[in-house]
């Protein structure tokens, strides 16, 4: 059936970058400026995305692919295909409805985006605190108290078994 249809349908021969022009006896016409078709057999070309305002062009539109946008400096992409741009904050801050606000004590954000997260509670993980956290980074936990007791081995432990998705150290 597919083969029969393709023999009957001249539009199936139109490659990406063209469209099947019904106004011209279904011959393949190139996509007009500022439009594209990414697959063959299209009856229309799609309008190219325009990167305006806070968006800037990361990849120009071509006859076979849409333009790609990213965000101007001071903003970062959100959503599929960078559908939105959100204001950057400094490390140690998070974006609120009232703008960028410093992380509350006991929380940190080590990126220019996202929310402030609580410091790790080392004791919950059976660890001691090596260096306290700041607004910009998490606490660094140290060895477990058991490792510090008299008679504990000071020898470097063997490397743990490698977990899936982690390269060996």
């Amino acid at each position: 059936f597919e083969r029969t249809r393709s023999l009957q349908d001249p539009c199936s021969n139109c490659p990406a970058g063209t469209f099947c022009d019904n106004n011209r006896n279904q011959i393949c016409s190139p996509c007009p400026p500022n439009s594209f078709s990414s697959a063959g057999g299209q009856r229309t070309c799609d309008i190219c995305r325009q990167c305006k305002g806070v968006f800037r062009t990361r990849k120009e539109c071509s006859s076979t692919s849409n333009a790609e946008c990213d965000c101007t400096p001071g903003f970062h992409c959100l959503g599929a295909g960078c559908s939105m741009c959100e204001q950057d904050c400094k490390q140690g801050q998070e974006l609120t409805k009232k703008g960028c606000k410093d992380c509350c004590f006991g929380t940190f954000n080590d990126q220019k985006r996202g929310i402030c997260r609580p410091w790790t509670n080392c004791s919950l993980d059976g660890k001691s605190v090596l260096v306290n956290g700041t607004k910009e980074r998490d606490v660094v936990c140290g060895p477990s108290p058991a490792d510090l007791s008299p008679g504990a081995s000071s020898v470097t432990p063997p490397a743990p078994a490698r977990e899936p998705g982690h390269s060996p150290q």
Partner: nanobody, 125 residues
């Protein structure tokens, strides 16, 4: 793997100074923080000082504040402990320690603590 080698320990008199070094080798790129722990005879090992490798932020045990200074040279993968105005109670085996990852490391699949073999510091009167 990370290997740590301490040096600089010895016998000194009270009030003297000493500088310990800890040279790291191996996968040093993975080290987040390093520290000095000490273990007096028959006692628990205790944190003396620690430093974040990236920003140099430090943490000191109260009893050494103002006397000891921890520093690092990232280019040489070496950490130092400058110990001034040494006291009898500073006598201990001093261990170099290195940590990979922030927090407990558990979320990143890291659970790596590395220790040196220790260097003896003895302060006499």
């Amino acid at each position: 793997q990370v290997q740590l080698q301490e040096s600089g320990g010895g016998l000194v008199q009270a009030g003297d100074s000493l500088r310990l070094s800890c040279a790291a080798s191996g996968s040093t790129f993975s080290i987040t923080a390093m520290g000095w722990y000490r273990q007096p005879p028959g006692k628990q090992r205790e944190l003396v000082a620690a430093i974040i490798m990236s920003d140099g932020d430090t943490n000191y045990q109260d009893s050494v504040k103002g006397r000891f200074t921890i520093s690092r040279d990232n280019a040489k993968n070496t950490m130092y402990l400058q110990m001034n105005s040494l006291k009898l109670e500073d006598t201990a085996v001093y261990y170099c320690y290195a940590r990979t990852g922030y927090g407990s490391g558990r979320l990143m699949g890291h659970e790596y603590d590395y220790w040196g073999q220790g260097t003896q510091v003895t302060v006499s009167s």
